[in-house]
Amino acid sequence: TEVKVTQPEKSVSVAAGDSTILNCTVTSLLPVGPIRWYRGVGQSRLLIYSFTGEHFPRIRNVSDTTKRNNMDFSIRISNVTPEDAGTYYCVKFQRGSSEPDTEIQSGGGTEVYVLAK
């Protein structure tokens, strides 16, 4: 059965300087491959967070993603700024064999609105 990626919130609003959580769950970890968060779509999309061990300032995972059966890939963005506004996508990849990972499923997206303090 094909993996499903669920982003339950269509949109969230957050005051500048506050934190917000973007929720994402998957129905399967197979095929093996990373899960990454992006802002925007297409060529201009920006990598926001990758669950592959790198450090991303202001962003951290919410659940224990070192659990071998973890299906929750939600993230918390701290100290939100107006530049963080946009639509965020949680994307499941299948690892590539000697080529780049292949995107196999994306969540429906969560729009982040940043409110002035």
Partner: antibody, heavy 117, light 108 residues
Framework: DVQLVESGGGVVRPGESLRLSCEAS????????MSWVRQAPGKGLEWVAG???????YYGDSVKGRLTISRDNSKNILYLQMNSLTAEDTAVYYC???????????WGLGTLVTVSS | SYELTQPPSVSVSPGQTARITCSGG??????YAWYQQKPGQAPVTVIH???KRPSDIPERFSGSSSGTTVTLTISGVQAEDEADYYC???????????FGGGTKLTVL
């Protein structure tokens, strides 16, 4: 620099117990999954057990029920409680740090456990 | 679970290319790594996540995969590369780590 230092090995009789420790430094221990891997004299590597940063545990088939992995994130120490030891448990025991996808990137020097009557 | 199969031994002359294969995993659910172990020493990770080389490992070590077979390639082998090499796998279906039986690399 990442450092993993095992201790607690020694000579015990069949049926006895032993607790191994692995002191970690040079990285954020509380954020990483960890494992124990053993190697019997003249033999290959065998995965024993793994533990997530939040202490979910996983075991190899040969040790289920007799060996217990645990951790103390406040002390940066990984443990392996070994009960009802048999001669087949004689090995060098290594602690290893897990990558995001549960392979191993850093290893300790190992501690030798000898079970003999 | 599954078994990973490696050749017991591989021999190569200095400066030549050594290739060590590992088969038996399911590419759909398994990630692979390669571990080097010299006599009396702890293992050292030379490749993880199929083809990722830790920063302190020489560039002559590389990993690749094709179907259910993964390969460790050592280009321009040096005498210091003589060691046992273990293929390791993590199976995302069973949550289990497995090792191959090891390959003894001899530098002639």
């Amino acid at each position: 620099d990442v450092q993993l230092v095992e201790s607690g090995g020694g000579v015990v009789r069949p049926g006895e117990s032993l607790r191994l420790s692995c002191e970690a430094s040079g990285f954020t221990f509380s954020s990483n999954a960890m494992s124990w891997v053993r190697q019997a004299p003249g033999k290959g590597l065998e995965w024993v057990a793994g533990i997530s940063s939040g202490s979910d545990t996983y075991y190899g088939d040969s040790v289920k029920g007799r060996l217990t992995i645990s951790r103390d994130n406040s002390k940066n120490i990984l443990y392996l409680q070994m009960n009802s030891l048999t001669a087949e448990d004689t090995a060098v025991y290594y602690c290893a740090r897990e990558t995001w996808n549960h392979l191993f990137d850093y290893w300790g020097l190992g501690t030798l456990v000898t079970v003999s009557s | 679970s599954y078994e990973l199969t490696q050749p017991p031994s591989v021999s190569v002359s200095p400066g030549q290319t050594a290739r060590i294969t590992c088969s038996g995993g399911d590419y759909y659910s398994t990630y692979y790594a390669w571990y080097q172990q010299k006599p009396g020493q702890a293992p050292v990770t030379v490749i993880h996540s199929d083809d990722k080389r830790p920063s302190d490992i020489p560039e002559r070590f590389s990993g690749s995969s094709s179907g259910t077979t993964v390969t460790l390639t050592i280009s321009g082998v040096q005498a210091e590369d003589e060691a046992d090499y273990y293929c390791g796998g993590y199976d995302g279906r069973t949550y289990i780590n497995t090792f191959g039986g090891g390959t003894k690399l001899t530098v002639l």
